[in-house]
């Protein structure tokens, strides 16, 4: 059979190196030789290129070499396939060399901040050695922070007269390391060069960019003063490397700004003992380059009523994330503070907190929480300077089977009845939310039975048992991940009751 007609011809001019054309050869059953026929010098000259490789992958490509390639030029390219049964020609294709030129990538040799200009780095590069002198070059510069995987791009052209091979990349984060790569293309071409080798550069350090401030209100003490734990952290989006030398805090009663107290600390939290009235707390962080903007927080008076607006809240795990959703009756509330900490019997030392805006849900990556630990999660509505009543739930980022089953007892043994009681599994052993208990019981040598009850029930009465019979009973506690049996207990029903 005749060879298949070569299709999808594509040509690239690797500038000042070679012109390579490739095509789809079709399914060849016998040895096929390909000849690429070109006309060049604006139709004045023609020549051929013949594939001589025996492997099918290499046979679908052929190259023409210098010196018989000059730009600008128009080519026609036609591919002939030949086997023992004959010859078949492709369609004639037409190419302008300028449109298919591909250069070497540029070489970045310096990425540096410019003294005194904030949030900017200057990229300097060398044009590809083999690039048309007579053409403007287009560039795409891509950049990302070192700890990110997503690239951002800027595009620009450099006119052929332009001696200055630099670009000022602005609008960056301060004191942040960036990864930079550059590619270029001849103005008329549809082919980009490959990306240059990546180069790192860092923006200049600045004064801290801000703080987020939160508080934990504790019950008033006997003297009427109330301990308030102030917590703060770098504002979201602050540079990872941002340095802070310390914090200035000042606070005063809402009714009297003259009673301002000030203090300094290098810690990330502070315990204040405030009176029963409402207070304003303000703070800044500072480093050798200056101060951050002021963060302020209002502490309500002890007797102040806080508003309520969260009606329902639920947590679920979806795609490696713990998702908390809530419904609010207040349409004007669009900022929320989320608090979460492990539910352990000791006082929480590791309180985490984060604000959410323009949403009534919050997500956290599963791996940021300990698996099999119960977390208390509270959501506070925030409206202007007021903080509303929180809504709290418990949730696990990842559930497991309980590490031990319930401790079980048998009570009120009768002729045909018995009461099985069990204790809640200690928090540390639950590994998940206990969703139900299952009581398994079986007469000696008889058939087994089971009964499942919800997690709020800690006892169950078995009925219709056989008199004077030995039974074995066991209670299983289950989470969404599975169940664990407690120890099995033996008991024997009575032969008769006092009423008989």
């Amino acid at each position: 059979a005749l060879p298949a007609k070569p299709e999808n011809i594509s040509c690239v001019y690797y500038y000042r190196k070679n012109l390579t054309c490739t095509w789809s050869p079709g399914k060849e059953t016998s040895y096929t030789q390909y000849t690429v026929k070109r006309t060049y010098a604006f139709g004045e000259k023609h020549d051929n290129c013949t594939t001589n490789s025996s492997t099918s992958e290499n046979r679908a490509s052929c190259s023409f070499f210098l010196p018989r390639i000059t730009i600008p030029d128009n080519y026609t390219i036609e591919v002939e396939a030949e086997n023992g049964d004959g010859v078949i020609k492709s369609h004639m294709t037409y190419w302008r060399l300028e449109n298919i030129a591909k250069t070497e990538p540029p070489k970045i040799f310096r990425v540096k901040p410019v003294l005194g200009i904030k949030r900017m780095i200057q990229i300097e590069w060398i044009k590809p050695e083999l690039a048309p002198v007579s053409s403007d070059l287009k560039y795409t510069l891509r950049f990302r922070t070192v700890n990110s995987t997503s690239w951002m791009e800027v595009n620009f052209a450099k006119n052929r007269k332009d001696k200055n091979q630099t670009y000022n990349l602005t609008g960056l984060q301060p004191f942040t390391e960036y990864v930079i790569a550059l590619r270029c293309a001849v103005k008329e071409s549809k082919f980009w060069s490959d990306w240059s080798q990546e180069k790192m550069g860092m923006t200049e350090e600045e004064a801290p960019c801000g703080l987020e401030l939160w508080r934990v209100l504790k019950p008033a003490e006997a003297d009427g003063r109330r301990p308030v734990r102030l917590l703060w952290k770098k504002a979201r989006g602050a540079p990872v490397l941002e340095k802070t030398l310390g914090y200035n805090i000042w606070y005063y009663p809402e009714s009297n700004t003259n009673l301002t107290e000030t203090m300094n600390t290098t810690n990330q939290q502070l315990e204040l003992h405030l009176g029963g009235e409402s207070f304003w707390v303000s703070m800044i962080s500072y480093n050798s380059l200056g101060k951050s903007p002021v963060a302020t927080l209002r502490i309500p008076a002890i007797q102040e009523k806080s508003f309520q607006c969260i009606e329902v809240m639920q947590a679920c795990v979806a795609e490696d994330q713990l998702v908390v959703k809530w419904q609010s009756s207040a349409l004007d509330v669009n900022t929320w503070m989320i608090e979460w900490f492990p539910d352990v019997d000791s006082e929480p030392t590791t309180l985490s907190w984060e604000s959410v805006s323009q949403a009534t849900n919050w997500t956290i990556q599963q791996d940021k929480l300990k698996p099999f630990w119960c977390y208390n999660i509270s959501v506070y509505p925030m409206l202007h300077d007021k903080v509303g009543e929180p809504y709290s739930i418990q949730a696990y980022a990842k559930e497991g089977v309980p590490s031990e089953g319930p401790e079980t007892k048998v009570e009120n043994i009768g002729v045909k009845t018995v009461t099985i009681t069990w204790k809640e599994i200690p928090k540390s052993e639950r590994k998940g939310i206990i969703c139900n208990y299952t009581i398994f019981y079986q007469a000696e040598g008889g058939k087994g039975f089971s009964k499942t009850v919800n997690s709020s029930i800690l006892q169950y009465g078995l009925e219709s048992l056989k008199r004077k019979t030995s039974y074995i009973v066991q209670v299983m506690a289950s989470t969404s991940a599975g169940g664990t049996n407690g120890t099995s207990i033996n008991f024997k029903t009575l032969s008769f009751s006092v009423f008989e």
Partner: antibody, heavy 119, light 107 residues
Framework: DVQLRESGPGLVKPSQSLSLTCTVT?????????WNWIRQFPGNKLEWMGY???????SYNPSLKSRVSITRDTSKNQFFLQLNSVTTEDTATYYC????????????WGAGTTVTVSS | DIVMTQSPATLSVTPGDRVSLSCRAS??????LHWYQQKSHESPRLLIK???QSISGIPSRFSGSGSGSDFTLSINSVEPEDVGVYYC?????????FGGGTKLEIK
């Protein structure tokens, strides 16, 4: 032939987020091109907002600071615009348009969708 | 950013006239300049790319010229369907910017 259709809410309240979808038919958004959002204000002024390229890289107009985000769903052949903290100044007709990555012009435009920001 | 300035803001012409619309860039943008036409209630349509390259399907009466910072869109013999707003676009440097437009009216 590539065709584009913008969709999203026609009315958004100030301070909320504006979210628009561009559905592309006739071409895969992961094959080639940079997929742009451009808006036109009531006085006819045009503003390029940003793009997401076929490879997933993004480019944004610095004038929109950090308010703008362009993402995509390759399984649905859609790309999205999110503009946060909108004001009445963001009232405009929003267009999506592809751009050959080596040719920085827009030869195909969607029909546009009008968004009004008002309380 | 490169600022694109178009003049005049409005142009009233008679059918058959030859008209010239001007666009000036705040920096040298070589010939990375593109022209669009927008008719009432329609999306913009590309007319000319790279200052002077024609686009298939666009009538030959539309032509462009210029390089550096001064550009001109010419309509050889205006027809009534040419009414609309004409925009130039900087395709040279990020971010892409558009001129304020020239409105073409028929007297």
């Amino acid at each position: 032939d590539v065709q584009l259709r913008e969709s999203g809410p026609g009315l958004v309240k100030p301070s909320q987020s504006l979210s628009l979808t561009c559905t592309v038919t006739g071409y895969s958004i992961t094959s080639d091109y940079a997929w742009n959002w451009i808006r036109q204000f009531p006085g006819n002024k045009l503003e390029w907002m940003g793009y997401i390229s076929y490879s997933g890289s993004t480019s944004y107009n610095p004038s929109l600071k950090s308010r703008v985000s362009i993402t995509r769903d390759t399984s649905k052949n859609q790309f999205f615009l999110q503009l946060n903290s909108v004001t009445t100044e963001d009232t405009a007709t929003y267009y999506c348009a592809p751009m050959i990555t080596t040719d920085w012009f827009f030869d195909v435009w969607g029909a546009g969708t009008t968004v009004t920001v008002s309380s | 950013d490169i600022v694109m300035t178009q003049s005049p803001a409005t142009l009233s012409v008679t059918p058959g006239d030859r008209v010239s619309l001007s666009c000036r860039a705040s920096h040298d943008i070589s010939d990375f300049l593109h022209w669009y036409q927008q008719k009432s209630h329609e999306s913009p349509r590309l007319l000319i790319k790279y200052a002077s390259q024609s686009i298939s399907g666009i009538p030959s009466r539309f032509s462009g010229s210029g390089s550096g910072s001064d550009f001109t869109l010419s309509i050889n013999s205006v027809e009534p369907e040419d009414v609309g707003v004409y925009y130039c676009q900087n395709g040279h440097s990020f971010p892409w910017t558009f001129g304020g437009g020239t409105k073409l009216e028929i007297k």
